[in-house]
């Protein structure tokens, strides 16, 4: 099949003793191969401060990933999720301020 | 860990057609694989299918596939199975269970509904 | 289709012993995403399955220490190192890495 180019959403959950977890969702891609990684000032996050989902099919033909990490609250702008797939690349940063959410979807 | 509330007991004449709940609560049900799985009395487990709540995709054991039709309602947080042309090889516990996706326990089945006895009898 | 086949199909015990049940697939159970999902499942009577083990070792929370499971390939096995009152009941090995999906016949865990 031809490429389909994946969704990223970036959510941070509830704050918890000055930390917050910062999730990056890659969904609806195909081919299955992606990269998906946390970096911090520009450079990956080693592989035991990530925890990472499973690549899992949605049902409708393509694919979903995800990956997160705990940082502290207030270094939000240092965070950035970088995605790799089928040659396209992308980076995502943590939603600042009140706003919970961002996504975008590759072309 | 929340809660997965299945509908009561049916009792159907072959032929006719029955729907299934599950309704959820206490987690975020979007991020959610529901599967359902039929057991007869005395017997083990068969899984019939699994609806991504994300997004309405599915995926069916091709052995219920012209048998069982999964749909999602979003808004009520509610998983449905209706089950066809029922027969009394139909006769059946049917459970719901999840999958949390973006939880950390990596297991098709971690939590569970206490299911619905559905019973085909003219 | 993938055959869950387990042995043995009952298990009288003494509480306090240790107890092992086997599952064997008609196949390997690795997921496209390289993951093995073999899990088990403890069904008391009147009751729904719960899940002990996934992805062949990992214990799911507020499991016992006392069930472990392990295995690769087409081999695989829980254990439970001192059987208690609340173990008994029926196991079920399930694999969730080819559709369609597919359960073990069971054990019944029972009193000697």
């Known amino acids: 099949g031809s490429t389909v180019p994946p969704m990223v959403n970036v959510t941070c959950s509830e704050v918890s003793e000055g930390n917050i977890t910062v999730t990056c969702r890659a969904s609806s891609f195909y081919p299955r191969n992606i990269t998906l990684t946390w970096r911090q000032d520009g450079v990956s996050l080693s592989h035991n401060t990530q925890q990472w989902g499973d690549v899992l099919p949605d049902g409708n033909g393509t694919y979903q990933t995800w990956v997160a990490t705990r940082i502290r609250q207030g270094e939000e702008q240092r965070f950035t999720c970088y995605m790799e797939h089928s040659g396209n690349h992308g980076t995502h940063p943590v939603p600042s301020g009140n706003s919970h959410h961002h996504h975008h979807h590759h072309h | 860990q929340g809660q997965m509330q299945q509908s009561g007991a049916e009792l159907v004449k072959p032929g006719a057609s029955v729907k299934l709940s599950c309704k959820t609560s206490?987690?975020?049900?979007?991020?959610?694989?529901i599967s359902w799985l039929k057991q007869k009395p005395g017997q083990s487990l068969e899984w019939i299918a699994w609806?991504?709540?994300?997004?309405?995709?599915?995926s069916y054991n091709q052995k219920f596939r012209d048998k069982a039709q999964l749909t999602v309602d979003t808004s009520s947080r509610t998983a449905y199975m209706q089950l066809s042309s029922l027969t009394t090889e139909d006769s059946a516990i049917y459970y719901c269970?999840?999958?949390?996706?973006?939880?950390?326990?990596?297991?098709?089945?971690?939590?569970w509904g206490r299911g619905t006895l559905v019973t085909v009898s003219a | 289709d993938v055959l869950m086949t387990q042995t043995p199909l009952s298990l009288p015990v003494s509480l306090g012993d240790q107890a092992s049940i086997s599952c064997r697939s008609s196949q390997h159970i690795v997921h496209s995403n390289e993951n093995t999902y073999l899990e088990w499942y403890l069904q008391k009577p009147g009751q729904s399955p719960k899940l002990l083990i996934y992805k062949v070792s990992n214990r799911f929370s507020g499991v016992p220490d006392r069930f472990s499971g392990s295995g690769s390939g087409t081999d695989f096995t829980l254990k439970i190192s001192r059987v208690e009152a609340e173990d008994l009941g029926v196991y079920y090995c399930?694999?969730?890495?080819?559709?369609?999906?597919?359960f073990g016949g069971g054990t019944k865990v029972e009193i000697k």
């Open positions: 399930f694999q969730g890495s080819h559709v369609p999906w597919t």
């Open positions: 269970a999840r999958h949390d996706y973006y939880g950390t326990s990596g297991a098709w089945f971690a939590y």
């Open positions: 206490g987690f975020t049900f979007s991020d959610n694989y």
């Open positions: 609806i991504y709540a994300g997004t309405g995709g599915s």
